[in-house]
């Protein structure tokens, strides 16, 4: 039973809805934190209902697991809440966002955004200098994360009057324009968020919390680990097997992920003197599509066949290579007789309605 069209439509949904989910985001939370995951719809288009899935199983909302459009909150997290989370389009199971969540016994300096600190602030009656409200969550002074991940530094504090918070990088004032992609300063959560970190984000980050009675500071060290180079990764299930009617149009899709610039080719397997492979075992192929001067990667990810004939039936391969190596996925095209022929073949036991 061919699952071809199923996987193909997922690929097409991705095209309509905007970019594929980025590299899996890795987040670390402390025990007792509120895990909050956000997944805005790619492309902003209507996506229909979504569902959050943890380790392959759909998450059921409860008093502790709160769901809303594009958002998941797991309150009072424990080690059991660690795992692979994904936000999926409910209808197709298309993955919109990936998260790898780790809940450690030691509370994290991660931004749990649980709002508890704001509530504590209101309870400060006596005038006084700033102080840390969650010092136990600030133990993790050194953070090492892979490139492309999101980093959150947090300095939950209180004081009367309510102190201000500012951030330094390597001892100098740190503002959004200092990095590509900017930064998110969430003053109510006393946090600094940097998305999609790169090696140039390495350094010492200091939060400075002050009011008229005093000032406190905390320094975190960020190390960004280079992503390990690898050959292109091809999305599972693409291209997908397809069945088409004679004379119709067909599209094969191939989704390629590669840090290094990939080179994509579409090949069709052919027979030479009745053989599909050469003496050395290498398959005989003909190149249908390859990078040209005006061809974009996006165009190369789709192979279009127009007005298919029976000769078009066979095996097609998407081949992607970069400086590290090659990857390839194949799919089959089956071509059926046209509708008119089916109707004419009534005596043979086939009828076509519509």
């Amino acid at each position: 039973e061919s699952l071809g069209t199923e996987q193909r439509v997922v690929g097409r949904v991705a095209e309509v809805s905007g970019p594929e989910p980025s590299q899996q985001e890795q987040l670390v939370f402390g025990s007792g934190d509120a895990v909050e995951l956000s997944c805005p719809p790619p492309g902003g288009g209507p996506m229909g209902p979504t569902v959050w899935v943890k380790d392959g199983a759909g998450l059921v909302p409860s008093e502790r697991v709160l769901v809303g459009p594009q958002r998941l909150q797991v309150l009072n997290a424990s080690h059991e809440d660690s795992g692979a989370y994904s936000c999926r389009q409910r209808l197709t199971q298309l993955v919109l966002c990936h998260f790898s969540v780790r809940v450690t016994d030691a509370p994290s300096s991660g931004d749990d955004e649980d709002g508890e600190d704001e509530a504590e602030d209101t309870g400060v009656d006596t005038a006084g200098a700033p102080y840390w409200t969650r010092p136990e969550r600030m133990d993790k002074k050194l953070l090492a994360v892979p490139a492309a991940n999101t980093v959150r530094f947090r300095c939950p504090a209180a004081g009367n009057p309510t102190p201000s918070i500012s951030w330094l990088k390597n001892g100098k004032e740190f503002r959004g324009e200092h990095r590509i992609g900017g930064i998110k300063l969430r003053h109510q959560q006393w946090s600094l968020v940097m998305e999609s970190v790169v090696p140039s984000d390495r350094g010492n980050y200091t939060c400075v919390v002050e009011n008229k009675f005093g000032s406190i500071r905390q320094t975190y060290t960020l190390d960004v680990l280079e992503r390990s180079p690898h050959r292109p990764i091809l999305q599972a299930g693409l291209p997908a097997n397809q069945t088409a009617v004679l004379g119709s149009d067909v599209e094969f899709h191939c989704k390629v992920y590669s840090d290094a610039q990939p080179h994509i080719q579409w090949l069709k397997h052919v027979e030479v003197n009745g053989s599909k492979v050469g003496p050395d075992g290498t398959p005989y192929v003909t190149v249908l599509k390859t990078a040209g001067a005006n061809t974009t990667d996006k165009e190369l990810e789709v192979l279009s066949l127009h007005n298919v004939t029976f000769e078009d039936a066979g095996e097609y391969t998407c081949l992607a290579g970069n400086s590290i190596g090659f990857s390839h996925h194949s799919a089959w095209l089956v071509v059926l007789p046209a509708e008119e022929e089916l109707v004419e073949a009534d005596e043979a036991g086939s009828v076509y309605a519509g």
């Epitope: 071809g4 439509v9 309509v16 209902p49 899935v53 909302p61 769901v67 459009p69 209808l91 199971q93």
Partner: antibody
Framework: EVQLLESGGGLVQPGGSLRLSCAAS????????MSWVRQAPGKGLEWVSG????????YYADSVKGRFTISRDNSKNTLYLQMNSLRAEDTAVYYC??????????????WGQGTLVTVSS | QSVLTQPPSASGTPGQRVTISCSGS????????VSWYQQLPGTAPKLLIY???KRPSGVPDRFSGSKSGTSASLAISGLRSEDEADYYC???????????FGGGTKLTVL
């Protein structure tokens, strides 16, 4: 065994209200998305509304938007459809339909036997 | 008028293969899965095919689904008298933010 039992149908005048119930058993009701689908006499199927547990979202067909409200009571394993400002064209058999597990492709894998709603003066 | 278009009727003799088409657009079939439902006279609909071509357990392999572009089709091979029923295709429609059904095809086994 999965069972869906609709009730609450009957004869109502145009402009009137009716509340349909669907009692579910044989599965963990709170974990599943549910929908109402109707079928006018001698006509085809028409999806009316769906309630999605995965993100708490609710959707309605344009033909009932603003008049019908879908809801659920997980403690009672019951799905509801509150129908207000009823019109003659709302006359139909109303089916309660269970969706597949939320980590699978959506489809209506179980249906109730339906309850007939007649809107007539 | 239904958003998904099906032929109102189809027929065949026992043993034959019948195909029912379902035509939509890029906002539904073109970018979403199609499911098919069988409704025997006087009964509730029953799921026949989902995710374009998958069969739930218990559905005979005589029933198969396929899709190309914005059209889907249901094929029934080795037609039997008990296959006489109404058949509906369905898909989510992004522009309408809801499920849409085809108008239904009444299959007659001659």
């Amino acid at each position: 065994e999965v069972q869906l039992l609709e009730s609450g149908g009957g004869l109502v005048q145009p402009g009137g209200s009716l509340r349909l119930s669907c009692a579910a058993s044989g599965f963990t009701f709170s974990s599943y998305d549910m929908s109402w689908v109707r079928q006018a006499p001698g006509k085809g199927l028409e999806w009316v509304s769906g309630i999605y547990s995965g993100d708490g979202s609710i959707y309605y067909a344009d033909s009932v938007k603003g008049r019908f409200t879908i809801s659920r009571d997980n403690s009672k394993n019951t799905l509801y459809l509150q129908m207000n400002s009823l019109r003659a064209e709302d006359t139909a058999v109303y089916y309660c339909a269970k969706d597949a597990p939320t980590n699978e492709m959506s489809r209506f894998d179980y249906w109730g036997q339906g309850t007939l709603v007649t809107v007539s003066s | 008028q239904s958003v998904l278009t099906q032929p109102p009727s189809a027929s065949g003799t026992p043993g034959q293969r019948v195909t029912i088409s379902c035509s939509g657009s890029s906002s539904n079939i073109g970018n979403n899965y199609v499911s098919w439902y069988q409704q025997l006279p006087g009964t509730a609909p029953k799921l026949l095919i989902y995710a374009d071509s998958k069969r739930p357990s218990g559905v005979p392999d005589r029933f198969s689904g396929s899709k190309s572009g914005t059209s889907a089709s249901l094929a029934i091979s080795g037609l039997r008298s008990e296959d006489e029923a109404d058949y509906y295709c369905a898909s989510w429609d992004y522009s309408l933010s809801g499920y849409v059904f085809g108008g239904g095809t009444k299959l007659t086994v001659l």
